[in-house]
């Protein structure tokens, strides 16, 4: 099943210590979806979306980004016939930067 | 089926105040952000506003930005849209936009309301 | 703010055809675009969403693809009710911007 989509949402850190909002997004025929939050390979956090919700966003307190790792990536699972488990493709990385750039 | 109701348009003279309805009907209102876009006679469209499910959070174009105030009522099911000290370039049709099944703006938008036109003239 | 443009601002075709349009925008938007079909008088309705995903209930002759900064959108097998008027438009930031459409009528 096709892979989320991730982003950076506001309000952006402007430095290591504030706290990551980062959005992850199933294509809209998936709603309801378990989400799950990677950094370099090792679970950061899972969330459901509500049923009626095709995404999630993991707020990651202060501090988040100075632990070893890389980019974080997302995934998500749903129930497919028979009751079994799917699991997405991993979204692309996302990269935090300091400060966040706006356009 | 989902559908948005805009109600209010009219003529209006330059200066005066309007406010548009738009009330949602066939899901959970509360659980989507919504959005105010608009389209002038014959022109492209224009991203007016967002406001996030709970209402704690409220962006605008810079063109409305100080005189227009988008708001809603999830025990209704109901958008709205406070417009001040309009003018002729505010003249176009008004249409609600839910938020592509999530709860901020960064979700895109999916279906839209039929639009109510607003017609600024002396 | 992200300036979004679209190539042809109109065409002309025929029932049965393919036609491509293209949209670029001014910044990267990754696969945060959305394309809209719009018949005179009507509402906007969502086609194509994350630049390549069909709304439920959509046609498969409608298609998108792309990513950054250039995207395509694609309809093979022109049908009557196709002849109107689309356009792109990116979420991935505010403001909300849109391509100033491509009108596709009747040759």
């Known amino acids: 099943i096709p892979a989320p989509s991730i982003r950076l949402v506001p309000p952006y850190p402007s430095s290591q210590e504030d706290p990551i909002h980062i959005a992850c997004m199933a294509p809209g025929n998936f709603p309801g979806a378990n989400f799950t939050l990677y950094r370099g390979g090792q679970v950061v956090q899972l969330l459901q979306a509500p049923t009626d919700q095709r995404g999630v966003t993991f707020n990651l307190s202060g501090g988040s980004s100075k632990a070893p790792g890389g980019p974080f990536h997302c995934q998500y699972g749903v129930l497919g016939e028979l009751n079994q488990s799917q699991l997405s493709d991993l979204s692309e990385p996302v990269n935090v930067s300091f400060p966040v750039p706006t356009w | 089926e989902v559908q948005l109701v805009e109600t209010g348009g009219g003529l209006i003279q330059p200066g005066r105040s309007l406010r548009l309805s738009c009330v949602a009907s066939?899901?959970?209102?509360?659980?989507?952000?919504m959005h105010w876009v608009r389209q002038a006679p014959g022109k492209e469209l224009e991203w007016v506003a967002v406001?996030?499910?709970?209402?704690?959070?409220?962006q605008y174009a810079y063109s409305v930005k100080g005189r227009f105030t988008i708001s809603r009522d999830n025990s209704k099911n109901t958008l709205y849209l406070e417009m001040n000290i309009l003018g002729p370039e505010d003249t176009a049709v008004y249409f609600c936009?839910?938020?592509?099944?999530?709860?901020?703006?960064?979700?895109?938008?999916?279906?839209w309301g039929q639009g109510t036109t607003v017609t600024v003239s002396s | 703010d992200i300036q979004m443009t679209q190539s042809p601002s109109s065409l002309s075709a025929s029932v049965g055809d393919r036609v491509t349009i293209t949209c670029q925008a001014s910044?990267?938007?990754?696969?945060?675009l959305n394309w809209y079909q719009q018949h005179p008088g009507k509402a906007p309705k969502l086609l194509i969403y994350?630049?390549?995903y069909s709304e439920i209930g959509v046609p498969s002759r409608f298609s998108g693809g792309g990513s950054g900064t250039d995207f395509t959108f694609t309809i093979n097998n022109l049908q009557p009710d196709d002849f109107a008027t689309y356009y792109c438009?990116?979420?991935?930031?505010?403001?909300?911007?849109f391509g100033p459409g491509t009108k596709v009528d009747i040759k």
């Open positions: 066939d899901f959970r209102f509360s659980n989507h952000a």
């Open positions: 406001i996030s499910s709970d209402g704690s959070n409220r």
């Open positions: 910044h990267d938007i990754r696969k945060f």
């Open positions: 936009v839910r938020s592509h099944l999530g709860p901020e703006w960064y979700y895109g938008m999916d279906v």
């Open positions: 994350d630049a390549a």
């Open positions: 438009q990116q979420y991935e930031s505010l403001p909300f911007t």
